[in-house]
């Protein structure tokens, strides 16, 4: 089959890096520099994407495959092959249509992007609060109260500041 | 032709102040969110400041707020970054750029200037 098919098709011989020229009587030429082609066969070269602005170039483009991109300090990737640069907030923010916000009390963000989520609530599995939450990280839970030998009690570290810091119930 | 066109860069002493101007042609400014950018030499592009189209809100990376002021004149299709108490650590070429989105989200066909020089040294 792909003995007939190159009999049809000479442009079925023509590897990946290359196009097949039908201004020069149909031979495989080179793909032109800022170009690639990923496959063989193919009759154009795809224009190779430029990583502009806040995007960064992360992998150069060659001639069988695209550059790809990631985004500049500050900023992550949004969107399949990082097609939009979204920006960072600091741990314990979210992005909101206003910018970076604080986390309310009760929820947290460990990481620089994403949205706040609500503290663990250790009661729902029977459990303690042994670690307070934070803006920035989830509350610990500890053994259920019940677990614990008559006269201990469990540890806990000194609030912070600005938060009691007990799981939302 | 769409572009943008940053100018007002120069230089000036530790302390000075500069105010630098975006300006479009091609398409009304006030239909964009408008964002500062800046490079050093052999640094990453930093974000630095950033006016929505919507209500003028005004964004400010920690590194100059208190500084910079951002403002945008729609009648003029302008917007400038006024900048005061300007150090050594400010010495970069400034790009203005416009989101199609709002200030937080940046893609590849967004319009971008060609940037302007500024150099703080004494």
């Known amino acids: 089959f792909e003995r007939t098919r190159s009999l049809q098709d000479p442009c079925s011989n023509c590897p990946a890096g290359t196009f097949c020229d039908n201004n020069r009587n149909q031979i495989c030429s080179p793909c032109p520099p800022n170009s690639f082609s990923s496959a063989g066969g193919q009759r154009t070269c795809d224009i190779c994407r430029q990583c502009k602005g806040v995007f960064r170039t992360r992998k150069e483009c060659s001639s069988t495959s695209n550059a790809e991109c990631d985004c500049t300090p500050g900023f992550h990737c949004l969107g399949a092959g990082c097609s939009m640069c979204e920006q960072d907030c600091k741990q314990g923010q979210e992005l909101t249509k206003k910018g970076c916000k604080d986390c309310c009390f009760g929820t947290f963000n460990d990481q620089k992007r994403g949205i706040c989520r609500p503290w663990t609530n250790c009661s729902l599995d029977g459990k303690s609060v042994l670690v307070n939450g934070t803006k920035e990280r989830d509350v610990v839970c500890g053994p259920s109260p019940a677990d614990l030998s008559p006269g201990a009690s469990s540890v806990t570290p000194p609030a912070p500041a600005r938060e009691p810091g007990h799981s939302p119930q | 032709q769409v572009q943008l066109q940053e100018s007002g860069g120069g230089l000036v002493q530790p302390g000075g102040s500069l105010r630098l101007s975006c300006a479009a042609s091609?398409?009304?400014?006030?239909?964009?969110?408008i964002a500062w950018f800046r490079q050093a030499p052999g640094k990453e592009r930093e974000w630095v400041s950033c006016?929505?189209?919507?209500?003028?809100?005004?964004y400010y990376a920690d590194s100059v707020k208190g500084r910079f002021t951002v403002s945008r004149d729609n009648a003029k299709n302008t917007v400038d970054l006024q900048m005061n108490r300007l150090s050594p650590e400010d010495t970069a070429v400034y790009y203005c750029?416009?989101?199609?989105?709002?200030?937080?989200?940046?893609?590849?066909?967004?319009?971008w200037g060609q940037g302007t020089q500024v150099t703080v040294s004494s």
């Open positions: 006016i929505e189209k919507s209500d003028s809100s005004a």
């Open positions: 750029a416009a989101p199609q989105s709002d200030c937080f989200h940046y893609k590849e066909n967004d319009y």
């Open positions: 091609g398409f009304s400014l006030g239909l964009y969110a």
